[in-house]
Interface confidence: low
Amino acid sequence: GELETSDVVTVVLGQDAKLPCFYRGDPDEQVGQVAWARVDPNEGIRELALLHSKYGLHVNPAYEDRVEQPPPPRDPLDGSVLLRNAVQADEGEYECRVSTFPAGSFQARMRLRVLVPPLPSLNPGPPLEEGQGLTLAASCTAEGSPAPSVTWDTEVKGTQSSRSFTHPRSAAVTSEFHLVPSRSMNGQPLTCVVSHPGLLQDRRITHTLQVAFLAEASVRGLEDQNLWQVGREGATLKCLSEGQPPPKYNWTRLDGPLPSGVRVKGDTLGFPPLTTEHSGVYVCHVSNELSSRDSQVTVEVLDPEDPGKQVDLVSASHHHHHH
């Protein structure tokens, strides 16, 4: 006769491992007992269980509730056992020794491989700012056995680099994604993809990119000079910019305080019915945590009673300050 077994048994952490050991012999042969042992190069042999044809299953207390026979129906020639809830520490070599009558004893060894699915963690890099050079956007780490594969899925242009650290029973893989930040990347997904033989499907963790920037400021509202006449109602100046984080707006008048009745509402400066007192240089200040920018305009309110006067508007230089 001979033993039917497997060279390698592979299970995922927490699954039950079936350690196969089936004696295929002549019809009149019987299996008296099957002994199972763990064979460790450092600790030597450690008995797990004895499966006796008459007295049943006897389990080493260290493996109580963990070693069982497969569910019925069972063939009397089948010495296979189930190692319940396989853990990483179970990985290694196992031996079954089969005592038969009348053919004698047989033994076989097999290796149990326990796959430890990785638990990925994604760590964003330092805050991204437009104008930086190649910068770490995020790193993704996954530890498992065997070593997991860590890659990136994104439409964003960048470079990825990986390194791994080997531990006694597992390996940790860290992949970094570097990019040159630009505002177009804002809101773009950066997904870490972890593959592993112990996973039914890839694990994915998505990080949404945020790139700090502040656009140049400009002022709208003076396009039609003829609208800026004494008595006109509803005149407004609107400051235009965009940024991440969203910028805050403020209005001042360069040549004195804002005239009475002029109201600031966010990015918009609202005027009461216009008078010549409203003529002057107005400055829009735009700022966020990254930087600040200014844009100034000169407003001259035309008095229809004074036909020699023309509305003059000048968009002056834009100023930009980094924080």
């Epitope: 952490l13 927490g14 520490a89 638990l119 963690s121 531990h167 694990r203």
Partner: antibody, heavy 121, light 107 residues
Framework: QVQLVQSGAEVKKPGASVKVSCKAS????????MHWVRQAPGQGLEWMGW????????NYAQKFQGRVTMTRDTSISTAYMELSRLRSDDTAVYYC??????????????WGQGTLVTVSS | DIQMTQSPSSLSASVGDRVTITCRAS??????LNWYQQKPGKAPKLLIY???SLQSGVPSRFSGSGSGTDFTLTISSLQPEDFATYYC?????????FGQGTKVEIK
């Protein structure tokens, strides 16, 4: 039997640091991850991070990065959690919890009795 | 981060009742869901791991089910020692997160 015994209650002033210990017995200390979980008075549970006692490798919750340090001394089977720059909202019971062998990364099969840390000026 | 939401936040029941607590994850966590029991002044205790596996030593009246985003803890016949607060927790990815808890009180 598996036991995790933590150090006693602490009262600290804002801005100070606290170091809580967790002594393990009844199992192979280096064979299981150790996690730290806290619970503010009357509130739910909040995971802070883990340490792999075998390698010393750590993984901290983003919320605590820069303020928490987890270490271990394998010679005395003890894990430590140090939290710095304490604030009043750090007042909580701090637990150490063993990561199970089945799921070392996220299932806590044994817990310490907890250490009350009170932050008050 | 994955958010875990439990319902109800509290419930009143009598000894012998069948009690069901639900937990919802903000994204699919497969079966990486665990349940804990906590009594006042005590540390939490693991009841169920991997959504439905009963932790050794835990009475069989406790059972768990579900996968993906929706999970359930069931106590088939409530015993006096079961009055406590129950927490779900995901172990799909870090940071590991808990539900806000469900307090089971005596009616």
């Amino acid at each position: 039997q598996v036991q995790l015994v933590q150090s006693g209650a602490e009262v600290k002033k804002p801005g100070a640091s606290v170091k809580v210990s967790c002594k393990a017995s009844g199992y192979t200390f280096t064979g299981y991850y150790m996690h730290w979980v806290r619970q503010a008075p009357g509130q739910g549970l909040e995971w802070m991070g883990w340490i792999n006692p075998n390698s010393g490798g750590t993984n901290y919750a983003q919320k605590f990065q820069g303020r928490v340090t987890m270490t271990r001394d394998t010679s005395i089977s003890t894990a430590y959690m140090e939290l710095s720059r304490l604030r009043s909202d750090d007042t909580a019971v701090y637990y150490c919890a063993r990561g199970s062998a089945l799921h070392f990364f996220g299932v806590f099969d044994y817990w310490g009795q907890g250490t009350l840390v009170t932050v008050s000026s | 981060d994955i958010q875990m939401t439990q319902s109800p936040s509290s419930l009143s029941a009598s000894v012998g009742d069948r009690v069901t607590i639900t937990c919802r994850a903000s994204q699919s966590i497969s079966s990486y869901l665990n349940w804990y029991q906590q009594k006042p002044g005590k540390a939490p205790k693991l009841l169920i791991y991997a959504a439905s596996s009963l932790q050794s030593g835990v009475p069989s009246r406790f059972s768990g089910s579900g996968s993906g985003t929706d999970f359930t803890l069931t106590i088939s016949s409530l015993q006096p020692e079961d009055f406590a607060t129950y927490y779900c927790q995901q172990s799909y990815s870090t940071p590991l997160t808990f539900g806000q808890g469900t307090k089971v009180e005596i009616k």
